[in-house]
């Protein structure tokens, strides 16, 4: 049995999420569970720091992209949303909230604005943006 989850505000098209093929969860109520990750889209616009705080308050973090295979549903995300990728001026690296460094070839980085934070957009693209610019955001929780 497959559950057709269609979130018009988040995805470009209908996203099929398996319910019985393998157990996924637990996730907070109304979050999407997919391949051992919980995701939620928040459509209120906040700057990066406020978005991070919002995710943390729900025991989650901003979206971390770590695998094109495990996170293939992200291909279909529409518009732009804050993710947990930031530039660290002290060492010049781009890293995730957990301190891990951005893996090469995982995201196509577009230097859209002069900033130190990044927005996620469809097809594994990251758009550099000023951290103080308000945007919608995606929170993520690992289930394992």
């Amino acid at each position: 049995i497959w559950s057709a989850v269609f979130l018009n505000s988040l995805f470009n098209q209908e996203v099929q999420i398996p319910l019985t093929e393998s157990y996924c969860g637990p996730c907070p109520k109304n979050w999407i569970c997919y391949k051992n990750n919980c995701y939620q889209f928040f459509d209120e616009s906040k700057n990066w720091y406020e978005s991070q705080a919002s995710c943390m308050s729900q025991n989650a973090s901003l979206l971390k992209v770590y695998s094109k295979e495990d996170q293939d549903l992200l291909k279909l995300v529409k518009s732009y949303h804050w993710m947990g990728l930031v530039h660290i001026p002290t060492n010049g690296s781009w890293q995730w909230e957990d301190g891990s460094i951005l893996s090469p070839n995982l995201l196509t980085i577009i230097e859209m604005q002069k900033g130190d934070c990044a927005l996620y957009a469809s097809s594994f693209k990251g758009y550099i943006e000023n951290c103080s610019t308000p945007n919608t955001y995606i929170c993520m929780q690992r289930t394992v």
Partner: antibody, heavy 122, light 112 residues
Framework: EVKLLQSGGGLVQPGGSLKLSCAAS????????MSWVRRAPGKGLEWIGE????????NYAPSLKDKFIISRDNAKNTLSLQMRKVRSEDTALYFC???????????????WGTGTTVTVSS | DVLMTQTPLSLPVSLGDQASISCRSS???????????LEWYLQKPGQSPKLLIY???NRFSGVPDRFSGSGSGTEFTLKISRVEAEDLGVYYC?????????FGAGTKLELK
Amino acid sequence: EVKLLQSGGGLVQPGGSLKLSCAASGIDLSRYWMSWVRRAPGKGLEWIGEINPDSSTINYAPSLKDKFIISRDNAKNTLSLQMRKVRSEDTALYFCIRRRYYGSSYWYFDVWGTGTTVTVSS
Amino acid sequence: DVLMTQTPLSLPVSLGDQASISCRSSQSIVHTNGNTYLEWYLQKPGQSPKLLIYRVFNRFSGVPDRFSGSGSGTEFTLKISRVEAEDLGVYYCFQGSHVPFTFGAGTKLELK
């Protein structure tokens, strides 16, 4: 190899118009800010302006804002500089350049075009 | 606009000499993000300019370590520890902190 190939330069009469082009190879221009800089004979480099990847932000040198229009066509991987009401002092070698803004640690011009010469004369 | 003043405009050297070029900005070029976007470019005869130094003191990839940048606020310096023939050309300082961005007038490094 990353290259920015420029064209469109030449002789133009005072008061006339000209459009310079910059075509990229080995690089996807749609990911980067691009700039134009010129060097007049016997003078130094002068920054004209810059444009961001989706053309939502374009910055010009105020003294040149009414003379130049910077645009881009990401589908064709090209950058353009429209010149209008040219005068003799616009005679120069014009460069298109990629400017990196890869986080606040990395702001710089790293790939320069071949340059194209514009001569304003009657 | 930020005026970038380079000195000297001409610098005659012998190969192996140390060379020093000064660049002064008419106001602070510390960006609101705390960084100072002072860059140095070299234009050799018949070539497009090339990046040497960014953010005051960072050498760009492939630039020999005989090139070094220093300074802060409004006073900046480019030093070449031992000049080689391939170093001859016109050096420009550039500020990318405040729009409109501006170049110095250039310093011509030439043989005595």
